[in-house]
């Protein structure tokens, strides 16, 4: 998905809506005319601003993804909130699409963290403790190397 | 449009320029500020709005003050570095069609 | 603030060549942008608007385009006077994101 929000302004801005700007910025849910002197209101669920602003222009809602759910639809003065689907997440890092989460741990760790639209499962070693980090195998089912060896989604 | 006030000054002294319009309204028009060193790009600075609201690029902010009268709008550096040795530019903005029309600018060197 | 990125830096073509500036905006502007001229000593001057907009006076040789992140200044038929320094610069937002200019392109004709 794609968002794009206002920077948040760095002063106290006036808290009633008008139709005319004031000190130089239209409400949220409004952008600035052309002239500079009124404000116009977004269009509900076509696009929005979440606050005090001088753009020409409102942003335009986010449309959830094919595996997305939509929490909160976009209002004047809110995007869209979208969420992955059961099953799948969406990390930080790669943030255009949802992934799906693994069914398992590899052999010798231990579930802690269940699968959430945020994060994947989390997996502990059984011994120590520490988390697990990088690519592993699907599921614990599917490790062939022997005792000892360390996991390898190559072996 | 135009700039006046620009000189020499000693680091650390704080200057105001000038900005005097004729044949329009500052009470209508926004206002920019624009600097260019010696060489180098357009640099913006700051504009304060037809009701009288300034505002300013992150890296301006506590270094100048804009402000203005019926007739003029002023330029304040509250305390001049030499990195601020450039020509000054105060130009009308309008919202959708940009900065219309500029002045000729005003040099300002800051030198020990 | 917008950051606007312009390339290139310099560019250099012969009399009745064409020249290709980009710039590109940090955030989406629409099609509010503005291209400025300026040669040395002088202050810039406004070459378009919004995008495409030909200011008063300006040879259709000058073209503009582009909307949301993404504009072109196009100059064709070059000439020994359109030699100079160009800037671009976003008009949406300018109290909440600021109005940075570009980094100028130098257009050398040779």
């Known amino acids: 998905i794609t968002q794009q929000d206002l920077a948040p302004q760095q002063r106290a801005a006036p808290q009633q809506k008008r139709s005319s700007p004031s000190e130089g910025l239209c409400p949220p849910g409004h952008h600035i005319s052309e002239d500079g002197r009124d404000c116009i209101s977004c269009k509900y669920g076509q696009d929005y601003s979440t606050h005090w602003n001088d753009l020409l222009f409102c942003l335009r809602c986010t449309r959830c993804d094919s595996g997305e759910v939509e929490l909160s639809p976009c209002t004047t003065t809110r995007n869209t909130v979208c969420q992955c689907e059961e099953g799948t997440f969406r990390e930080e890092d790669s943030p255009e699409m949802c992934r799906k989460c693994r069914t398992g741990c590899p052999r010798g760790m231990v579930k802690v963290g269940d699968c959430t639209p945020w994060s994947d499962i989390e997996c502990v070693h059984k011994e120590s403790g520490t988390k697990h980090s990088g690519e592993v195998p699907a599921v614990e089912e599917t490790v062939t190397s022997s005792p000892g060896t360390p996991a390898s989604p190559c072996s | 449009v135009e700039e006046s006030g620009g000189r020499l000054v000693t680091p650390g002294t704080p200057l105001t320029l000038t900005c005097t319009v004729s044949g329009f309204s500052i009470s209508r028009y926004a206002m920019i500020w624009v600097r260019q060193a010696p060489g180098e790009g357009l640099e913006y600075i700051g504009f304060i709005t037809s009701d009288s609201s300034a505002y300013y690029a992150s890296w301006a902010k506590g270094r100048f003050t804009i402000s203005k009268t019926s007739t003029t709008v002023d330029l304040k550096m509250t305390s001049p570095t030499t990195e601020d040795t450039a020509t000054y530019f105060c130009a009308r903005y309008t919202y959708s069609d940009g900065t219309d029309l500029w002045g000729p600018g005003t040099l300002v060197t800051v030198s020990s | 603030d917008i950051v606007m990125t312009q390339t290139p830096a310099s560019v250099s073509e012969p009399v009745g060549g064409t020249v290709t500036i980009k710039c590109q905006a940090s955030?989406?502007?629409?099609?509010?942008l503005s291209w400025y001229q300026q040669k040395p000593g002088q202050p810039p001057k406004r070459l378009i608007y919004k995008a495409s907009t030909l200011a008063s006076g300006v040879p259709s040789r000058f073209k503009g385009s582009g909307s949301g992140t993404d504009f072109t200044l196009t100059i064709r038929d070059l000439e020994c006077a359109d030699a100079a320094t160009y800037y671009c610069q976003p008009n949406s937002g300018i109290a909440t994101y600021g109005a940075a200019f570009g980094g100028g392109t130098e257009v050398v004709v040779k």
């Open positions: 955030q989406s502007i629409s099609t509010y």
